[in-house]
């Protein structure tokens, strides 16, 4: 025999004090599949957590974090607090990237700055604490005579021509 | 050990003010965020104030905004909550709570560790 539960799509629950008819999930509770004998509470949004998307009777409430604030864990169990660019939260708190390191987000670790070197290139921008080198040809490409790319022309002032 | 033990509950008539606190000792309290959570008698846990590590974010239930205010001396190891225009609804056993990880704040199902409580009575 079938069960009849299992006729009940999500966003109802299978009613064992009505005869095991489908009812619709009460406020503030969804089943997300069929045939289930209860719905689910939906989760609430409140304080550093807010709503990024509202409960449905067939799906729970999703949240996010307040600005100054960033998810952690899964379904963002968790908000974080942000640090500034260039710097990196640690046991005591949010801290400066040390010396040839650097961090362009409000969240997650510093990391050294790219080794030019290894790839046989040369700096072309200097690193900071929020942001990475710029590698630039390799030191060979910037030999006098093996430049590709052509001189600008000489600026002329107005009113003389060539000689 | 984590220890946190709340102090300042009492009777007081509805409009009057009460301040509780909180004091924290076994963990650097300055590296975690703080909260308050009652029960009122035969209901369930109710999340009341939220606290950053730094004492510079707040966060409160909709029901409470405006009368309480949640605060944090880091140098003293002591959560406060000041309670103004206090409401028979707001008779409750209040706790204290620590969040589980530094500079983050948490769900209530994930606090690690509780106070023991303190009870406010708001009645005539």
């Known amino acids: 025999l079938q069960d009849p539960c299992s006729n009940c799509p999500a966003g109802t629950f299978c009613d064992n004090n009505r005869n095991q008819i489908c009812s619709p999930c009460p406020p503030n509770s969804f089943s997300s599949a069929g045939g289930q004998r209860t719905c689910d509470i939906c989760r609430q949004c409140k304080g550093v957590f807010r709503t990024r998307k509202e409960c449905s009777s067939t799906s729970n409430a999703e949240c996010d974090c307040t600005p100054g604030f960033h998810c952690l864990g899964a379904g963002c169990s968790m908000c974080e607090q942000d640090c500034k660019q260039g710097q990196e939260l640690t046991k005591k708190g949010c801290k400066d990237c040390c010396f040839g390191t650097f961090n362009d987000q409000k969240r997650g670790i510093c990391r050294p700055w790219t080794n030019c070197s290894l790839d046989g290139k040369s700096v072309l921008v200097n690193g900071t604490k929020e942001r990475d080198v710029v590698c630039g040809p390799s030191p060979a490409d910037l030999s006098p005579g093996a430049s590709s790319v052509t001189p600008p022309a000489p600026a002329r002032e107005p009113g003389h021509s060539p000689q | 050990q984590v220890q946190l033990v709340e102090s300042g509950g009492g009777l007081v008539q509805p409009g009057g003010s009460l301040r509780l606190s909180c004091s924290a000792s076994g963990f650097t309290f300055s590296s975690y965020a703080m909260s308050w959570v009652r029960q009122a008698p035969g209901k369930g846990l109710e999340w009341v104030s939220d606290?950053?590590?730094?004492?510079?974010?707040?966060f409160y239930e909709d029901s409470v905004k405006g009368r309480f205010t949640i605060s944090r001396d880091n140098a003293k190891n002591t959560l406060y909550l000041q309670m103004n225009s206090l409401r028979a609804e707001d008779t409750a056993v209040y706790y204290c709570a620590k969040h589980p990880l530094t500079y983050t704040i948490a769900t209530m199902n994930d606090y690690d560790y509780w106070g023991q409580g303190t009870l406010v009575t708001v009645s005539f």
């Open positions: 606290i950053n590590s730094g004492g510079e974010s707040t």
